[in-house]
């Protein structure tokens, strides 16, 4: 049977450290993180970390019993917390039967956003006490709410992250651009900006407050010439104040309406 | 059944580069380390080095090091090791070698004598 | 780098003897140990693996023991195709290093 790995959560030093080990296995070959969206039986996501790990391809992973990942989080607060896992089986080759190294993974640190983490990861039996072990670590900074993955948090789709305004911006004429976009039923009030280096023009925006997605449209003066210019949705939502996701889209020409066929130009114009 | 198959015999001159092929049959290339060992005429065996075919992650033998590049092509199965810098004293027979469950060498090709002469 | 010291370099017997090779590496290679043999102009054939593992084919007039630094191959009753070069070699983690080789010669 292949090797596999059973991970608990292991807070102080490790047994194994405490005993003399004439021979020890090698370092990590490779470590990595990832967050990963898993669901929770409330229905909401959990953003988790996925730790793999690659094994030396060496004789010396004979010796091995387990691999410890310890997380250290900063952000307002500090977390710490260790796990480790243990491998059902003893080594019988470096390397997988089907080829490659030997990859293992482990999928349960709670992730938050925009948090800086520590990850240290070693095998055990580790080095003797007044020895240095071989161990290996990465930081990874968790991202914000536009992540991919992050934006399935509860507190990002309350800042309307899974929102899509589906913004279209068109110039009128010289004065005027039309917004359209998908109202969220998170709120009812947003900020409409065109802006080429410089705001062009600004509108606020109150929809009648409904729990339903509609389309609401904005005609916004503008003081300077707008097609290519940027547009900029700022939702005030109650749960994220002023600190709401923003969205962007870009002006374009509106569409020519009421022009049921070219105009032909031998045909004489009334009134000549 | 298992065979290394490896080019014929090279002679070279002082500083050229010789290229040594091997060719795997009758086992999943990826599935194991090859190695390089080298035999100069009446002495012992020296590790050179090995390739995992897999991913090509490589570990060289450091008096090696600066003069030797492993490689290897998956679609045709060979593992080729290339010798540059060459020096008389690097007359010998080379081999190729597959490891086994860990690296011992349960499989050897038939050797190509690389002779280098002025 | 782990050093393999091989003894005797060379020895002599006849057909119908027991005979003994003995390696030493300079640490602990936890048992990681092969034995090979090698006939002249051949490719060198492995005999054993960790330690005692008899690889396919290979008599069983081939044994080995040993642990920790020291280690013996065994041939117990010596045939006429077993003169050639023996060589021990370790694999506790590149570089792989192999003993200077023991050749048996007939008496």
């Known amino acids: 049977r292949e090797p596999t790995v059973q991970c608990g959560s292991e807070t102080g030093p490790s047994p194994e450290w405490m005993l003399q080990h004439d021979l020890t296995p090698g370092d990590l070959r490779d470590l990595r993180v990832e967050p990963v969206k898993t669901s929770v039986a409330t229905g909401d996501y959990s953003i988790l970390m996925n730790v793999s790990w690659v094994l030396r391809a060496d004789a010396s992973i004979r010796l091995l019993k387990a691999t410890k990942i310890c997380v250290t989080g900063k952000s307002n607060f500090q977390s710490y917390s260790c796990v480790r896992c243990n491998y059902t089986e003893a080594f019988q080759t470096q390397t997988r039967p089907s080829g490659g190294k030997w990859t293992f993974s482990y999928i349960g640190f709670p992730v938050e956003l925009n948090t800086v983490y520590f990850i240290g990861a070693h095998n055990i039996p580790n080095a003797n006490m007044n020895e240095d072990g071989p161990s290996m670590s990465l930081n990874f900074t968790s991202p914000g709410c536009l992540d991919h993955i992050m934006k399935y948090k509860k507190k990002c789709v309350k800042a309307g992250s899974l929102w899509d305004p589906n913004i279209t911006a068109c110039k009128k004429n010289e004065e005027t651009v039309e917004v359209n976009f998908t109202t969220s039923p998170l709120g009812n009030r947003y900020m409409a900006l065109i802006q080429h280096s410089t705001i062009i023009g600004f509108s606020q925006v109150s929809e009648p407050y409904q729990n339903k997605q509609t389309r609401a449209s904005v005609v916004i003066p503008v003081t300077e010439e707008s097609e290519g210019a940027m547009v900029q949705l700022t939702p005030y939502f109650p749960t994220c104040g002023s600190d709401c996701i923003r969205h962007k889209g870009t002006v374009v020409l509106c569409p020519q309406t009421g022009v049921p066929f070219p105009l032909d130009n031998n045909r004489s114009k009334p009134g000549g | 059944q298992v065979q290394l198959v490896q080019s014929g015999a090279e002679v070279k001159k002082p500083g050229a580069s010789v290229k040594v092929s091997c060719k795997a049959s009758?086992?999943?290339?990826?599935?194991?380390?090859m190695n390089w060992v080298r035999q100069a005429p009446g002495q012992g065996l020296e590790w050179m080095g090995r390739?995992?075919?897999?991913?090509?992650?490589?570990q060289y033998n450091q008096k090696f090091k600066d003069r030797v590049t492993m490689t290897r092509d998956t679609s045709i199965s060979t593992a080729y090791m290339e010798l540059s810098r060459l020096r008389s004293d690097d007359t010998a027979v080379y081999y190729c070698?597959?490891?086994?469950?860990?690296?011992?060498?349960?499989?050897w090709g038939q050797g190509t004598l690389v002779t280098v002469s002025s | 780098d782990i050093q393999m010291t091989q003894s005797p370099s060379s020895l002599s017997a006849s057909v119908g003897d027991r005979v003994t090779i003995t390696c030493r590496a300079s640490e602990n290679i936890n048992s990681n140990l092969a034995w090979y043999q090698q006939k002249p102009g051949k490719a060198p054939k492995l005999l054993l693996y960790?330690?005692?593992n008899l690889a396919d084919g290979v008599p069983s007039r081939f044994s080995g023991s040993g642990s920790g630094t020291d280690y013996t191959l065994t041939i117990s009753s010596l045939q006429p195709e077993d003169f050639a070069t023996y060589y021990c070699?370790?694999?506790?983690?590149?570089?792989?290093?192999f003993g200077g080789g023991t050749k048996v010669e007939i008496k």
């Open positions: 960790d330690v005692t």
């Open positions: 390739i995992d075919p897999y991913d090509s992650e490589i």
């Open positions: 070698a597959r490891s086994g469950g860990f690296d011992w060498f349960a499989y």
């Open positions: 009758g086992y999943t290339f990826i599935s194991y380390w």
């Open positions: 070699q370790h694999f506790w983690g590149p570089p792989y290093t």
